[in-house]
Interface confidence: medium
């Protein structure tokens, strides 16, 4: 598995460097997860032709994946730090069940899938420390998540491949959009 952020050889070789700020640590964590997603997407694309599927075909899939919208306060127009932070944390919490689904979907990148899942948990902790209004963050219902997981795992092979591809793509886009927003904070 790849080395988690803050433990790469460059950091070890340069102990005199300034400690990372909270923002830099979050940035590094997100980029580490994005690197993991890239590796998982490679395996998915090599294994099936889902990556060539048109966006329209993918949009027909009825997965309720988190997505940023204007009202979430994360875009430059109408930016609202606290509303946006709540959206990012809530979205990441909602992605957790989908990341759990990914755990048995990879052969050669099994460790990578686990690393993405665990690193996301760490990222949520970093962001929760940054948030002032933790009460506004809604945690997904475990029973609902469990039944969703069962439903996803019961799909036929083609739909499972489609779901895997869609989760990875949506998670990547959500993280990239979060990065854009977090850099304004």
């Amino acid at each position: 598995a790849p080395v988690p952020p803050g433990e790469d050889s460059k950091d070890v070789a340069a102990p005199h460097r300034q400690p990372l700020t909270s923002s830099e640590r979050i940035d590094k964590q997100i980029r580490y997860i994005l690197d993991g997603i890239s590796a998982l997407r490679k395996e998915t694309c090599n294994k099936s032709n889902m990556c060539e599927s048109s966006k329209e075909a993918l949009a027909e899939n009825n997965l309720n994946l988190p997505k940023m919208a204007e009202k979430d306060g994360c875009f430059q127009s109408g930016f609202n730090e606290e509303t946006c932070l709540v959206k990012i944390i809530t979205g990441l919490l909602e992605f957790e069940v989908y990341l759990e689904y990914l755990q048995n979907r990879f052969e050669s990148s099994e460790e990578q899938a686990r690393a993405v899942q665990m690193s996301t948990k760490v990222l949520i902790q970093f962001l929760q420390k940054k948030a002032k209004n933790l009460d506004a963050i809604t945690t997904p219902d475990p029973t609902t998540n469990a039944s969703l997981l069962t439903k996803l795992q019961a799909q036929n092979q083609w739909l499972q491949d489609m779901t895997t591809h869609l989760i990875l793509r949506s998670f990547k886009e959500f993280l990239q959009s979060s990065l854009r927003a977090l850099r304004q904070m």
Epitope: E24, D27, R31, K67, E70, Q176, S177, R183
Partner: antibody
């Protein structure tokens, strides 16, 4: 062939409006970051705006905020820069470019540029 | 906006020289920095991205380093085709450029 073809430049009076177009071929703008960069005569490069494909989220430099609008037409695979309330200091070559879909992004593809001259 | 300050503005050097251009950001930008080369009448081309990653097809005499606020572009042994203007660009927030460094023949 992967390329960006620009059009829409020209001579315009101060206070006027102009729309620049940038047609992409060989890739889809619906899954790529796009960016506009300008260069005043004999000067350096200045980032103007960018558009992130996810939800069409746009960012603008302070110098153009409120006057310029970046948009896209996915069916035409084209991005636009609508420039209003133009000033003499907006004169220059405007480049349409693509951010590489990486983290961090960088510009991996440029248009040839189109000249905008704001003068009375 | 994040302000990028490049130095020097002009640099005179000879073929075979080792040259270094520096770029400083007004706030921490992690490794969200790229270096571009521009020749007169042409669009710029990327040399280095992610502060130190060499773009495919770019000669290995070009190298980049730095993180946070201070960055450098080094050309280990100048070639005739390297005389041009060089720009740094941050992509942490927006995409502001440094003012450029014109590398000219001594």
């Amino acid at each position: 062939e992967v390329q960006l073809v620009q059009s829409g430049g020209g001579l315009i009076q101060p206070g006027g409006s102009l729309r620049l177009s940038c047609a992409a071929s060989g890739f889809t703008i619906s899954s790529n970051y796009m960016i506009w960069v300008r260069q005043a005569p004999g000067k350096g490069l200045e980032w103007v705006s960018d558009l992130y494909y996810y939800a069409g989220d746009t960012y603008y430099a302070d110098s153009v905020k409120g006057r310029f609008t970046m948009s896209r037409d996915i069916s035409k695979n084209t991005v636009y820069l609508q420039m209003n309330s133009l000033r003499a200091e907006d004169t220059g070559v405007y480049y349409c470019a693509r951010w590489a879909d990486d983290h961090p992004p960088y510009i991996d593809l440029w248009g040839r540029g189109t000249l905008v001259t704001v003068s009375s | 906006d994040i302000v990028m300050t490049q130095s020097p503005s002009t640099l005179s050097a000879s073929v075979g020289d080792r040259v270094t251009i520096t770029c400083r950001a007004s706030q921490g930008i992690s490794s969200w920095l790229a270096w571009y080369q521009q020749k007169p009448g042409r669009a710029p081309k990327v040399l280095i991205y992610k502060a130190s990653t060499l773009e495919s097809g770019v000669p290995s005499r070009f190298s980049g380093s730095g993180s946070g606020t201070d960055f450098t572009l080094t050309i280990s042994s100048l070639q005739p085709e390297d005389f041009a203007t060089y720009y740094c660009q941050q992509s942490w927030l927006g995409g502001s450029f440094g003012q450029g460094t014109k590398l000219e023949i001594k």
